[in-house]
């Protein structure tokens, strides 16, 4: 039975040209995290595999950085980066958990950031 829950940064906003950290945290389960996939709508951004480390998709190599932790840092943001992002936790023996983050990239220099989420 899947007992875990994913906490995410939720809805966040950031300024064009700036950077943002996407963060998820899996709790309430003892399942082993084998891999975390980060996806933007239907595009793979990055994979963090427990044994193999990080793979950043070629399309995003120049402006996506791994971490902190299992999170992902998006840099040089453009308005086209606005949209849904998913953290997909592959675990054993539970299976797959998915978290959702909505990022809005604003032209304005007064972008209000959502509450920063931090893994304890």
């Amino acid at each position: 039975m899947m007992t875990g829950t994913i906490e995410t940064t939720g809805n966040i906003s950031a300024e064009k040209g700036g950077s943002i950290i996407l963060q998820c945290h899996l709790s309430s389960t003892t399942a082993q995290v084998t891999q975390v996939n980060w996806e933007q709508q239907d595009q793979l951004l990055a994979i963090c595999n427990a044994d193999l480390g990080w793979h950043i998709s070629p399309s995003f190599k120049d402006r996506v950085a791994p971490g902190p932790g299992l999170g992902l840092t998006l840099q040089s943001l453009t308005v086209n980066d606005t949209g849904e992002y998913f953290c997909i936790y592959h675990t054993y023996p539970d299976g797959t958990y998915t978290g959702r983050i909505f990022l809005e990239v604003l032209e304005s220099s007064v972008a209000e950031h959502g509450a920063r989420f931090q893994i304890p």
Epitope: T34, Q35, N37, E39, D42, Q43, L44, I47, N49, D51, L52, G53, W54, H55, I56, S57, P58, S59, H90
Partner: antibody, heavy 121, light 107 residues
Framework: QVQLQESGPGLVKPSETLSLTCTVS?????????WIWIRQPPGKGLEWIGY???????YYNPSLKSRVTFSVDTSKNQFSLKLSSVTAADTATYYC??????????????WGQGTLVTVSS | DIQMTQSPSSLSASVGDRVTITCKAS??????LAWYQQKPGKAPKLLIY???YLQSGVPSRFSGSRSGTDFTLTISSLQPEDFATYYC?????????FGQGTKLEIK
Amino acid sequence: QVQLQESGPGLVKPSETLSLTCTVSGYSITSDYAWIWIRQPPGKGLEWIGYITSSGSTYYNPSLKSRVTFSVDTSKNQFSLKLSSVTAADTATYYCARLDFGNYGGAMDYWGQGTLVTVSS
Amino acid sequence: DIQMTQSPSSLSASVGDRVTITCKASQHVSTALAWYQQKPGKAPKLLIYSASYLQSGVPSRFSGSRSGTDFTLTISSLQPEDFATYYCQQHYITPYTFGQGTKLEIK
């Protein structure tokens, strides 16, 4: 230039253990890569057996997990496969390969030439 | 495990033809798909990774694309050395799995 070379007996009896070694040249096996075993029965498709990292972390395909063991010998720049309780269904060409996860994800960029192992009494 | 289904299983074509091979994943694999070429008695050779990225040294007549869980390998103008068997492989999640192969033969 990275080169991989499989070696081991070409004939194994049913119920025995198949043992193969892959020798890597032109690159240190201790580098940040995973080392893969894949097999291909005659005239058939490819089956991914699993990986071992230089630190000894392993992943085995669940279909073979109960019978397979990988090991790595960094001093000889080699990694090895053992498959126990073999049957005729294990007859295949066995390939070793390199997985450069950082650059290619789970795609294998360098392969050995393969070695045919026949299971027969 | 994720099942990969290639079509057609075999294909006859002539030098200069444009050829398309398709691969369908049984579930979401995003862009984590590779294509390999294998000639008789040889090891597979990586052609394309991450659905559309050409491996270094591979001729530009090879290209890859994706639509949902459907993937396509296109050879824009077949050359004599392209007659071989082609395999797709998902590299989204372990165990990585291959399609059953498409044998490209001379017409």
